[in-house]
């Protein structure tokens, strides 16, 4: 487990290091999961780089915020916001928020405790 | 069915200690986060403090911190809140509450809730 | 002062609907939970809804959560007398690594 550096990381601070790092990895990663690796997800050029690669690259990424729990939900609720409207119906937006839950512990950080990742506003 | 006793409460001098216990039955008690809610004289609820199944993590409200401390004994059913250092604001009933607080994508909410006991700090 | 911000006060005829809001912040209800509870005059508060929107078993589905943003509202349908009592919000704040409850909103049922 990384190092706790803050103990909940302040909302504003947390708000400046999710809009600086790049989640696309993340959503990729995520998104090759659900969809088994098929093809028919073109939204991404998802082909060019393996889900253990995109894997450590979203990782990476989120290594680059403050490692505390407040954070985390931030970048955790920004990607299902980003992935949403791609979401095509109730499964398989319930498919991604199980391997967005996965996610903290795959890259060995702590899971956001009470993150409410419904936060689309009905979208999702 | 799910019972939650608190006993303890009493008039006490600005400075003294209190320790509130509550009793619990009816459900697995080790399985489930616990809680204090306070409720001051005709004012609204306040959270106070909240206990980890285990024991192993605590939160405490700031004013409280440091006067406070919340404990459980898993194998008597029971919670308790040892208050030092007591002053006239935390004059209020003492509710003792089960928080429904599960994994990390759930909130705390508080499903089950005792009749209180009446803390008064005063000289 | 309650960080997180309900109406003191709302009134409404039987059988009617009303709404209570419930306005935070990014750090509380932006991010987490919300819960609703009812207190009636010299009782212990009561669980309305959990987790925004869930009811648990024996509330009638007469009352109703939602979240939007940093705002969470619970809603009330085919009012009774009985349900004159004080409403309170609550949810965790992660800033403060604390739960907060709103400053509760007193429903009159005229």
């Known amino acids: 487990m990384r190092r706790e550096r803050g103990r909940q990381g302040d909302s504003s601070s947390c708000e400046r290091q999710v809009d600086r790092v790049n989640l696309k990895p993340c959503e990729q990663h995520i998104m090759q999961r659900i969809m088994g690796e098929q093809e028919q997800y073109d939204s991404y050029d998802i082909r060019s780089t393996r889900s253990s690669d995109q894997q450590q690259r979203c990782c990476d990424e989120l290594n680059e915020m403050e490692n505390t729990q407040r954070c985390m939900c931030e970048a955790l609720q920004q990607i299902m916001e980003n992935q949403c409207d791609r979401l095509q119906d109730r499964q398989m937006v319930q498919q991604f928020k199980r391997e967005l839950m996965n996610l903290p512990q795959q890259c060995n950080f702590r899971a956001p405790q009470r993150c409410d990742l419904d936060v689309s506003g009905g979208r999702c | 069915e799910v019972q939650l006793v608190e006993s303890g409460g009493g008039l006490v001098q600005p400075g003294g200690s209190l320790r509130l216990s509550c009793a619990a039955s009816g459900f697995k008690f080790s399985t489930f986060y616990m809680t204090w809610v306070r409720q001051a004289p005709g004012k609204g609820l306040e959270w106070v403090a909240n206990i980890k199944q285990d024991g192993s993590e605590k939160d405490y409200l700031d004013s409280v911190r440091g006067r406070f401390t919340i404990s459980r004994d898993n194998a008597k059913n029971s919670l308790y809140l040892q208050m030092n250092s007591l002053r006239a604001e935390d004059t209020a009933v003492y509710y003792c509450?089960?928080?429904?607080?599960?994994?990390?994508?759930?909130?705390?909410?508080?499903?089950?809730w005792g009749q209180g006991t009446l803390v008064t700090v005063s000289s | 002062q309650s960080v997180l911000t309900q109406p003191p006060s709302i009134s409404a005829a039987p059988g009617q609907k009303v709404t209570i809001s419930c306005s935070g912040t990014g750090s509380n209800i932006g991010h987490n939970y919300v819960s609703w509870y009812q207190q009636l005059p010299r009782t212990a508060p009561r669980l309305l809804i959990f987790?925004?929107?869930k009811r648990p078993s024996g509330i009638p589905d007469r009352f109703s959560g939602s979240k939007s943003g940093s705002s969470a509202t619970l809603g009330i349908t085919g009012l009774q007398t009985g349900d004159e009592a004080h409403y309170f919000c609550?949810?965790?704040?992660?800033?403060?690594?604390?739960?907060?409850f709103g400053g509760g909103t007193k429903l009159t049922v005229l």
């Open positions: 987790d925004n929107t």
């Open positions: 609550a949810t965790w704040d992660a800033d403060l690594s604390a739960v907060l």
């Open positions: 509450t089960r928080n429904g607080l599960q994994d990390s994508y759930s909130g705390d909410f508080f499903d089950h």
